[in-house]
């Protein structure tokens, strides 16, 4: 569950469930910082613009990140 705020982390709960890359509008990877000591991954879905916080430690999510970056590298000239 994402919450917006200035300081502190954004994700309140995280999901281990993989997301279909085709249903993704946007995938944000927020590196650890002085505001939040952990990496946060926020997926925005095409349907309704729903947001989901993903577990960076989950194998399924790591595979998703690989798939997305592979897709991006294919698209870039």
């Amino acid at each position: 569950v994402p919450l917006s705020r200035t300081v502190r982390c954004t994700c309140i709960s995280i999901s281990n469930q993989p997301v279909n890359p085709r249903s993704l509008e946007k995938l944000e990877i927020i590196p650890a910082s002085q505001f939040c000591p952990r990496v946060e991954i926020i997926a925005t879905m095409k349907k309704k613009g729903e947001k989901r916080c993903l577990n960076p430690e989950s194998k399924a999510i790591k595979n998703l990140l690989k798939a997305v970056s592979k897709e991006r590298s294919k698209r870039s000239p």
Partner: antibody, heavy 121, light 109 residues
Framework: QVQLVESGGGVVQPGRSLRLSCAAS????????MHWVRQAPGKGLEWVAL????????YYADSVKGRFTISRDNSKNTLYLQMNSLRAEDTAVYYC??????????????WGQGTTVTVSS | EIVLTQSPGTLSLSPGERATLSCRAS???????LAWYQQKPGQAPRLLIY???SRATGIPDRFSGSGSGTDFTLTISRLEPEDFAVYYC??????????FGPGTKVDIK
Amino acid sequence: QVQLVESGGGVVQPGRSLRLSCAASGFTFSNSGMHWVRQAPGKGLEWVALIGFDGINEYYADSVKGRFTISRDNSKNTLYLQMNSLRAEDTAVYYCARDWPEGYYNGMDVWGQGTTVTVSS
Amino acid sequence: EIVLTQSPGTLSLSPGERATLSCRASQSVSSSYLAWYQQKPGQAPRLLIYGASSRATGIPDRFSGSGSGTDFTLTISRLEPEDFAVYYCQQYGSSPPFTFGPGTKVDIK
């Protein structure tokens, strides 16, 4: 099955302290934000506090800020509510509830049975 | 802080009738962040609707939610005996507190 069981309620004098516990089972507790919600006798629901899945984020209702502390022990699958400087108006049934972990906000999808706190002299 | 108002306070209906419950917010709430709960005497609340219009797991299709902005509605198309209870709306905005409405009691006429 997915379950939350609260304990620690009882009768306590005004100004004293009490610690509530909520034991979770049947789901990945360490992935889930957790809430405390209370209900005074004959009244509606009042959100009390929220803690993020890893304990970094804590939020409180104004009515309990500075007096109550929410915490968790993911190794024990347990949520806590430390209640200090208790007042008569804190008398209520206290529920712990799970913040739906899949996706954006889907509500509090799992609730405990509640534990009763009575503040009286 | 967003304040939620529910109306009516009590709704007296017979089994088989349609129930329409209203929840109004003091300021706009993203429909992604509006939920409805049912509570029966002596029991914990139960999540019915999330995201203003999506039914939670195991909730019968006679329950439906709608609305956006400041006005939201919970509709029970045909009341069953087990539907007589108190219903609460709740908002979960971009920051706490995550307020509940005062509730609507649906009782038997």
